[in-house]
C-alpha cells in the first residue's frame, strides 16, 4: 500500500490508477477506516458518504476535509477500456500540528542544591499525540538524571480527538553552576518528517544560599567528664546572622527547654550523663545539628573519658543560662 499523510481539515485526492479519465468507467472504491466496521463500498452515484469521501468524474476519490476517523485503507479497482484490471491501495494517516508550545507557571528564581519547579510546558491540538522535551542551554535534559524530573500528562479532546500535552519540569541546580540557565521546551510530532516546534526560552536566576558555617558545640570542662556535684556548661556557637534559634537534645530526644545558646548542668548526678547536641534552626536553611558530646561522671582517682563517648542517661536537673 502507498502511504499517504494528510493534514486534518485539508482536502485529499486519491487517484484510481488505470481508470479511464471520463465516464463510462468500471471502477469501485472501498474503504476500511474509523468510520467503517469492515469494508465500505462507495456508490459512484454518491450518497450520504459524500461529505466524507466521494468519487469524482475522473474516477479519483475526493475527501473534502480529512478527519481522524478517515485513517485507514482506501482501495480502488478499475478496468480500462481494454479490460485490464488495475488496483490502487492507499494507507492514509492523518496529523495535526499543534499551536506553538508555551511554558506556563515559569519560575523566575531557582535555589541551588534543592529541587525547584522550573515551569510547565503545554502543547494543544496535536495528532497523533507527539512528545514534549526540555532543553537546558540548548542541550536535551534527560529525566531522572542529575536532579532532573519530569511529570507528564496527556489529555484528549472528547469532540475533536486532538491531544493536549503537559510536561512539568523539576530541577536541582548544582551549587556553583550557571547563575542564568536557559530552559526551553519543544514539541516533536508523532508522525515523521515534521519539524519540532520550540517555546520561547525562559531564563530564571539561580540563587545560591550562603552555606551555614558549622555549628560548634563547646563543652566545659573540656572532654565533658566531671566529678559528682560539679557543673558542666555547653555553649552552641553559630556564626550565622541573624542568630538562629538553638534547641538542645539529649540522647536523641529534644529537651523541653526554651531556646538558648547556653545549657548549664549544675550539680551533676548520674541522671545527667548522656550524649548532648545542639540544633540551630535558621528560617531559610532549616535545622543544622552540632557534633555530639558525651557528659560523664568520674569518681576520684579515675581519668576522664574522651569527648564523644556515651555515658548513661536519665532525667537530669537542667538550667538555662
Amino acid at each position: 500500500a502507498q502511504n499517504i499523510t494528510a493534514r486534518i481539515g485539508e482536502p485529499l485526492v486519491l487517484k484510481c490508477k488505470g481508470a479511464p479519465k471520463k465516464p463510462p468507467q468500471q471502477l469501485e472504491w472501498k474503504l476500511n477506516t474509523g468510520r467503517t466496521e469492515a469494508w465500505k463500498v462507495l456508490s459512484p452515484q454518491g450518497g450520504p458518504w459524500d461529505s466524507v469521501a466521494r468519487v469524482l468524474p475522473n474516477g479519483s476519490l475526493f475527501l473534502p476535509a480529512v478527519g481522524i476517523q478517515d485513517e485507514g485503507i482506501f482501495r480502488c479497482q478499475a478496468m480500462n477500456r481494454n479490460g485490464k484490471e488495475t488496483k490502487s491501495n492507499y494507507r492514509v494517516r492523518v496529523y495535526q500540528i499543534p499551536g506553538k508550545p508555551e511554558i506556563i507557571d515559569s519560575a523566575s528564581e531557582l535555589t541551588a542544591g534543592v529541587p525547584n519547579k522550573v515551569g510547565t510546558c503545554v502543547s494543544e491540538g496535536s495528532y497523533p499525540a507527539g512528545t514534549l522535551s526540555w532543553h537546558l542551554d540548548g542541550k536535551p535534559l534527560v529525566p531522572n538524571e542529575k536532579g532532573v524530573s519530569v511529570k507528564e500528562e496527556t489529555r484528549r479532546h472528547p469532540e475533536t480527538g486532538l491531544f493536549t500535552l503537559q510536561s512539568e519540569l523539576m530541577v536541582t541546580p548544582a551549587r556553583g553552576g550557571n547563575p542564568h540557565p536557559t530552559f526551553s521546551c519543544s514539541f516533536s510530532p508523532g508522525l515523521p518528517r515534521r519539524r519540532a516546534l520550540h517555546t520561547a526560552p525562559i531564563q530564571p536566576r539561580v540563587w545560591e544560599p550562603v552555606p551555614l558555617e558549622e555549628v560548634q558545640l563547646v563543652v566545659e570542662p573540656e572532654g565533658g567528664a566531671v566529678a559528682p556535684g560539679g557543673t558542666v556548661t555547653l555553649t552552641c556557637e553559630v556564626p550565622a546572622q541573624p542568630s538562629p534559634q538553638i534547641h538542645w537534645m539529649k540522647d536523641g530526644v529534644p529537651l523541653p527547654l526554651s531556646p538558648s545558646p547556653v545549657l548549664i548542668l549544675p550539680e551533676i548526678g548520674p541522671q545527667d550523663q548522656g550524649t548532648y547536641r545542639c540544633v540551630a534552626t535558621h528560617p531559610s536553611h532549616g535545622p543544622q545539628e552540632s557534633r555530639a558530646v558525651s557528659i560523664s561522671i568520674i569518681e576520684p582517682g579515675e581519668e576522664g573519658p574522651t569527648a564523644g563517648s556515651v555515658g548513661g542517661s536519665g532525667p537530669g536537673t537542667l538550667a538555662l543560662a
Epitope: A38, G47, P48, D50, V52
Partner: antibody
Framework: EVQLVESGGGLVQPGRSLKLSCVVS????????MTWIRQTPGKGLEWVAS????????YYPDSVKDRFTISRDNAKSTLYLQMNSLRSEDTATYYC????????????WGQGVMVTVSS | DIQMTQSPSSMSVSLGDTITITCRAS??????VNWFQQKPGKSPRRMIY???NLADGVPSRFSGSRSGSIYSLTISSLESEDVADYHC?????????FGSGTKVEIK
C-alpha cells in the same frame, strides 16, 4: 437554541407547483447538510431530498426526481423545496431537518408544514 | 434499495415493562442507523444515533444495540411518556430508508 421553521404549505391542485421554505437559527447553517422528509397521514416517514452544505450537490429518491428541487441560501440561512407537477400522493406533512450525510443523522427537525394536493 | 423491516408494527404493554423494537436491514449499513420517537401531532425526535449512542437529553432507559443486520431499540421500565410511534432509519446509502414504524401503547 436550534430552530427550524417551515412555511409555504397549503392546498394545491394536481399538476401545480408549490415552494416550501425553512428558516433556521441557532447553528452555523453552512456547516451542515439539510434534508426534507415527509410523512403521509397515518403512514411512515419518507426521505424527499438532501443537499450538501455548500449547495452544489443534491440528492433525491426516484419518487420525486425531476419534479422536486432542493436548494439553499446560506446567506439567509434558508432551505427551500420547489415542488412541481404535484400529485395526490405528494400529500403529506413536510419536515425540514438538519443532516443527511453520515456525520449528522437528523438531530433537529422543524415543526412540519402540511401540503395537500387535491382537485 | 435497502429495506428496513421493522417489527412489531404495534405493541400494547404495561407501565414498567421492558420492550424491544427491531429493524432488519436488507444489506450492510454498518453503524448508520438512527431511532426516532414521534408523539401524536409532534415532529420526530432523535433518540439513538449510529446504532448505539444515546442522543442528548434522552433518558437512560432507552438503549440501542446491533447484532449483524438487526438493530434494536430497548426501553427498560416503560413510562407513560414513552407512549409514541418509533421509527428506525438507515442513512448509509441513498435512498435513505425508514422502517414502517412501531406504535407503543399502554394496556
Amino acid at each position: 437554541e436550534v430552530q427550524l421553521v417551515e412555511s409555504g404549505g397549503g392546498l394545491v391542485q394536481p399538476g401545480r407547483s408549490l415552494k416550501l421554505s425553512c428558516v433556521v437559527s441557532g447553528f452555523t447553517f453552512n456547516n451542515y447538510w439539510m434534508t426534507w422528509i415527509r410523512q403521509t397521514p397515518g403512514k411512515g416517514l419518507e426521505w424527499v431530498a438532501s443537499i450538501n452544505n455548500s449547495g452544489d450537490n443534491t440528492y433525491y429518491p426516484d419518487s420525486v426526481k425531476d419534479r422536486f428541487t432542493i436548494s439553499r441560501d446560506n446567506a439567509k440561512s434558508t432551505l427551500y423545496l420547489q415542488m412541481n407537477s404535484l400529485r395526490s400522493e405528494d400529500t403529506a406533512t413536510y419536515y425540514c431537518t438538519r443532516g443527511g450525510d453520515i456525520t449528522t443523522g437528523f438531530d433537529y427537525w422543524g415543526q412540519g408544514v402540511m401540503v395537500t394536493v387535491s382537485s | 434499495d435497502i429495506q428496513m423491516t421493522q417489527s412489531p408494527s404495534s405493541m400494547s404493554v404495561s407501565l414498567g415493562d421492558t420492550i424491544t423494537i427491531t429493524c432488519r436491514a436488507s444489506q450492510d449499513v454498518g453503524i448508520y442507523v438512527n431511532w426516532f420517537q414521534q408523539k401524536p401531532g409532534k415532529s420526530p425526535r432523535r433518540m439513538i444515533y449510529r446504532a448505539t449512542n444515546l442522543a442528548d437529553g434522552v433518558p437512560s432507559r432507552f438503549s440501542g444495540s446491533r447484532s449483524g443486520s438487526i438493530y434494536s431499540l430497548t426501553i427498560s421500565s416503560l413510562e407513560s411518556e414513552d407512549v409514541a410511534d418509533y421509527h428506525c432509519l438507515e442513512f448509509d446509502e441513498h435512498p435513505l430508508t425508514f422502517g414502517s414504524g412501531t406504535k407503543v401503547e399502554i394496556k
